[in-house]
Amino acid sequence: QEEDLPRPSISAEPGTVIPLGSHVTFVCRGPVGVQTFRLERESRSTYNDTEDVSQASPSESEARFRIDSVSEGNAGPYRCIYYKPPKWSEQSDYLELLVKETSGGPDSPDTEPGSSAGPTQRPSDNSHNEHAPASQGLKAEHLY
């Protein structure tokens, strides 16, 4: 019988509010034994896969997706999914990357540290929670 795969988690370092031109790293975490982590942006059809998986703890593996110089086009909702043979997991919650213009330059520390995706309120008519997706480092391909 196939095991029930836990949903992955997603976080962003140094945070989810990133000054223009600074770097951000998305961290996807799942159980041990993950073969591939996938970072999806806006739609399942736009994603980046990596098999560069490391062990974060005895029970957890992780992969890191870095954007070196964030542009406005990188803002948006991201989520993770992983493949642990023989099946894919469910998706993590979405994590929104916000890109802000800053006069402080690329090393400005004006970020939200250690942000990760958590429970979200059901959208109401006043919650508009989608932002511009990334164009850098993600590819549009047929999914799965």
């Epitope: 806006e42 736009t46 469910e90 979200t120 919650s127 932002h131």
Partner: antibody, heavy 119, light 107 residues
Framework: EQSVESGGGLVQPEGSLTLTCKAS????????ICWVRQAPGKGPEWIAC???????TYYASWAKSRFTISKTSSTTVTLQMTSLTAADTATYFC??????????????WGPGTLVTISS | ELVMTQTPASVEAAVGGTVTIKCQAS??????LAWYQQKPGQPPKLLIY???TLESGVPSRFSGSGSGTEFTLTISDLECADAATYYC?????????FGGGTELEIK
């Protein structure tokens, strides 16, 4: 707060038509708007989506050549349809799509606008 | 292109009974699935999203389960007002495909 479709009506075969989805009481700024149609007695059929934040457009494969989804303002999205045939006769709905957790939430649908293709 | 296959096409059940509707995706869609109820002359009404999350205001008699490619909608303690057509949908904005529908008749 709602979204309302307009622009439907009777069109001759091979004609063109532009439908409008207008937000009332909010703007679409950080949402996606999607068009779905439903022929009489049939099920809903996804046509296209427009992401306000990324300006990305997404189409069903059958719709790419004759349908164009676009933003005309922060509160309106249009669907341009060309080379219409009787098979395009349907009620056309627009839906506002949010994000909830790790999934999309198609929670707000307009009442629909009827498009009839006939000579 | 993703295809959503829904079964059965129609079902008849008694008041107070339970029905199960199945939806199969041709590719893995994770939890990107919604269920709708539709009555004549109305737009689809969202019942369940993210495969199993009940929309606000929808009775708990409606429940959804599944992930990946196999999904189920269960309606228990059936009422006359449940007579309608039910659809599943891939909620990804790059796909959006609907199932063919299940017509529920209450006797």
């Amino acid at each position: 707060e709602q979204s309302v479709e307009s622009g439907g009506g009777l069109v001759q075969p091979e004609g063109s038509l532009t439908l409008t989805c207008k937000a009332s009481g909010f703007d679409f700024s950080r949402n996606a708007i999607c068009w779905v149609r439903q022929a009489p007695g049939k099920g809903p059929e996804w046509i296209a989506c427009y992401s306000f934040s990324s300006s990305a457009t997404y189409y069903a494969s059958w719709a790419k050549s004759r349908f164009t989804i676009s933003k005309t303002s922060s509160t309106t999205v249009t669907l341009q349809m060309t080379s219409l045939t009787a098979a395009d006769t349907a009620t056309y709905f627009c839906a506002r799509v949010d994000i909830y957790g790790g999934s999309r939430y198609w929670g707000m649908w307009g009442p629909g606008t009827l498009v009839t293709i006939s000579s | 292109e993703l295809v959503m296959t829904q079964t059965p096409a129609s079902v008849e059940a008694a008041v107070g009974g339970t029905v199960t509707i199945k939806c199969q995706a041709s590719q893995n869609i994770g939890g990107d699935l919604a269920w709708y109820q539709q009555k004549p002359g109305q737009p689809p009404k969202l019942l369940i999203y993210r495969a199993s999350t009940l929309e606000s205001g929808v009775p708990s008699r409606f429940s959804g389960s599944g992930s990946g490619t196999e999904f189920t909608l269960t309606i228990s303690d059936l009422e006359c007002a449940d007579a309608a057509t039910y659809y599943c949908q891939d909620t990804d904005i790059g796909s959006g495909a609907f199932g063919g529908g299940t017509e529920l008749e209450i006797k």
